[in-house]
Amino acid sequence: QLPPGKPEIFKCRSPNKETFTCWWRPGTDGGLPTNYSLTYHREGETLMHECPDYITGGPNSCHFGKQYTSMWRTYIMMVNATNQMGSSFSDELYVDVTYIVQPDPPLELAVEVKQPEDRKPYLWIKWSPPTLIDLKTGWFTLLYEIRLKPEKAAEWEIHFAGQQTEFKILSLHPGQKYLVQVRCKPDHGYWSAWSPATFIQIPSDFTMND
């Protein structure tokens, strides 16, 4: 029977800069029941606080609700593992909420084949930003990527779309069914998961080349 091994805070994420969650990996338990607590203070302060919510984020997590989240302050946190034989502490982790945002996937992905009379046909892809993100405040710049592939193809092709919420693709294989997905990230954060795939059947008379 031993003191617990050193835990590690391995990830912190925020969906929208208004709340965030951090997760830790326990070290070895030393063969004894082990309690974990996360403590933190804000940069420039000495007062230590304990994690306000160990439930919302699941096992080995700490969730910071709106009233505990501030964009303009760096959080310095550590996890303490304790059993009957002693304690061990994780390394301190410095967290700036601005840099840990991972939004939900974009919404309302719509894909359509456009066949104008006077121009070459194209695939028109359109989507909306995730609902949790408030783009009107200017705090957020969301960037988007699209990926698509024929249903039976092994590799996706990925396109960076900048801040635009629509994208055109020419030159597709006629008669094939394509899968299309979109994802987003804030300018300083992490890519969201890909949205659910939308399927589109390319007509057999689609002009292949431009």
């Epitope: 960037l143 092709e157 990925i158 396109h159 960076f160 635009q164 994208f167 020419l170």
Partner: antibody
Framework: EVQLLESGGGLVQPGGSLRLSCAAS????????WHWVRQAPGKGLEWVSD????????GYADSVKGRFTISRDNSKNTLYLQMNSLRAEDTAVYYC???????????WGQGTLVTVTS | QSVLTQPPSASGTPGQRVTISCTGS?????????VHWYQQLPGTAPKLLIY???WRPSGVPDRFSGSKSGTSASLAISGLRSEDEADYYC???????????FGGGTKLTVL
Amino acid sequence: EVQLLESGGGLVQPGGSLRLSCAASGFTFSSYWWHWVRQAPGKGLEWVSDISSLSSYTGYADSVKGRFTISRDNSKNTLYLQMNSLRAEDTAVYYCARGLDARRMDYWGQGTLVTVTS
Amino acid sequence: QSVLTQPPSASGTPGQRVTISCTGSSSNIGYGYVVHWYQQLPGTAPKLLIYRNNWRPSGVPDRFSGSKSGTSASLAISGLRSEDEADYYCAAWDDSLNGWLFGGGTKLTVL
């Protein structure tokens, strides 16, 4: 017929400024992404900047970030590159290029030479 | 540092098949971003030759073809002609740079 004509290049001293223009005709200018790409004498191509069709997104190579500004005037069918704090290593032929789907550069201008020397 | 690596030179005789490689990394070609190829004839502006890995713009002969696998892409030119003598560049978006990357270019000589 697609036509792209760059202008505004010339000789400038280090620390100086230039504004390049790219006048486009023969298609709907506002529907496309636009790029600036440069080529130093005897060297390869280097991407400089791009701007999205709705002007909402602008991107820059690290080597020019904070010194160059890309912009567009859809009413004049013209792309611009404002170059400030120019350095000797900015000496190159500057090309404008139209960005189609996947932002591939499907048409290029003939280029304008920028020479930065004291 | 993100780079696309091309051989500086390649050569072949008329009628031969020549392949030019473009090797990237997990932040560009390996990430899934598409590869474009440009041809620059001496003293002229670059011209789009292959786009989105393997598509040919109208007007480009079918002697030119592109492919992509993993972190690399290739341009193949079959039935080599003297007018193919040019510099060839690959290009791909790079996620870590948030910008376009060009390969260093390959000078093709037709012997």
